[in-house]
């Protein structure tokens, strides 16, 4: 079968890298400079993906690949196969259309990406707050406070470590 | 605010050269990211993409005109500049600079045009 | 380099109605897609970026769509101040124009 088909079509047994070039008699030629057949019986090769302004050439393109690119430093990839480029901003940030802005007070960030996101809200669970929160971080909500017995701490001292071998005191 | 003011533009005789300007507010062309360039428009016709500069100085010419155009920045007055030699009628057009991407989302586009200057090659 | 080719060159249309126009790239340029208007006089605008993300301050009657060598504008219901020339714009590699189309009043 595959024998037929190449009698058919000359242009089938020109494999990745190469193309089936009309101009000179259907002969299989490299693909130029600057471009790729990423399969074979290809009757023109495509051209690169040119990684430009802010974007930087994170693979090469080859005879048989396309190349691939990802953001400068201080940017974060956005969209199908990083075709736009994000401005990173610190923990305890978001990015607004005038730049970096501090989360406001309730509300944190913990990555160079996204949104402030609110603390949580321990009350909801029936739980207090053990650790509070701030702009790069959340709170950590700890026991009830009916958990606790009267006149303890809200904050519980870590317990021992524990030995292998040994039985908890 | 970001802003792009061209200069540089008028009558200009067939062989001889033209420097052109643009000048940019708001923004740093030297700042990570930022990525400038020139477009070209002949008069009743379609846009022509001629060349751009990066912030870090890396160049991207048009293949057809890559011989006769220099593109480069002065980072002390953050202005941008299109040398284009050997000039000839078909280069009569109004010429943009244009700023890749938008305020903080940055890609293969042009968020912001300057008002664009015209060049008339003729003698 | 990649053509773009634009269609139609020119259209009459009114108030009201839906447009579409359409890009053809001589390859896949799949995302790197953006869509500019322009005025007589004025600088492009830019409406639609990465083939479908309306750019800041552009009306919901524009949207972007397609795919590979395929693309569309489309214009859900032409407003007076819409009638301009329309390009679509690669950046897949380097840069280049479509030729434009002239959305005209009938």
């Known amino acids: 079968f595959e024998r037929t088909r190449s009698l058919q079509d000359p242009c089938s047994n020109c494999p990745a890298g190469t193309f089936c070039d009309n101009n000179r008699n259907q002969i299989c030629s490299p693909c130029p400079p600057n471009s790729f057949s990423s399969a074979g019986g290809q009757r023109t090769c495509d051209i690169c993906r040119q990684c430009k302004g802010v974007f930087r050439t994170r693979k090469e393109c080859s005879s048989t690949s396309n190349a691939e690119c990802d953001c400068t430093p201080g940017f974060h990839c956005l969209g199908a196969g990083c075709s736009m480029c994000e401005q990173d901003c610190k923990q305890g940030q978001e990015l607004t259309k005038k730049g970096c802005k501090d989360c406001c007070f309730g509300t944190f960030n913990d990555q160079k990406r996204g949104i402030c996101r609110p603390w949580t809200n321990c009350s909801l669970d029936g739980k207090s707050v053990l650790v509070n929160g701030t702009k790069e971080r959340d709170v950590v909500c700890g026991p009830s406070p009916a958990d606790l017995s009267p006149g303890a701490s809200s904050v519980t001292p870590p317990a021992p470590a524990r030995e292998p071998g040994h039985s908890p005191q | 605010e970001v802003q792009l003011v061209e200069s540089g533009g008028g009558l200009v005789q067939p062989g001889g050269s033209l420097r052109l300007s643009c000048a940019a507010s708001g923004f740093s062309l030297s700042t990570g990211g930022v990525a400038v360039g020139w477009i070209r428009q002949a008069p009743g016709k379609g846009l022509e993409w001629l060349a751009l500069?990066?912030?870090?100085?890396?160049?991207s010419y048009s293949t057809s005109l890559k011989s006769r155009l220099t593109i480069s920045r002065d980072n002390s007055k953050n202005t941008l500049y299109l040398q284009l030699n050997s000039l000839r009628a078909e280069d009569t057009a109004v010429y943009y600079c244009a700023r890749g991407g938008s305020d903080t989302v940055l890609g293969d586009w042009f968020a912001y045009w300057g008002q664009g200057t015209l060049v008339t090659v003729s003698s | 380099d990649i053509q773009l080719t634009q269609s139609p060159s020119s259209l009459s249309a009114s108030v009201g109605d839906r447009v579409t126009i359409t890009c053809r790239a001589s390859?896949?340029?799949?995302?790197?897609l953006a869509w500019y208007q322009q005025k007589p006089g004025k600088a492009p605008k830019l409406l639609i970026y990465d083939a479908s993300n309306r750019a800041t301050g552009i009306p919901s009657r524009f949207s972007g769509s397609g795919s590979g060598t395929d693309f569309t504008l489309t214009i859900s219901s032409l407003q007076p101040e819409d009638f301009a020339t329309y390009y679509c714009?690669?950046?897949?590699?380097?840069?280049?124009f479509g030729q434009g189309t002239k959305v005209e009043i009938k």
């Open positions: 500069i990066d912030w870090a100085g890396d160049k």
């Open positions: 714009q690669q950046g897949y590699s380097t840069w280049t």
């Open positions: 390859q896949g340029v799949s995302p790197y």
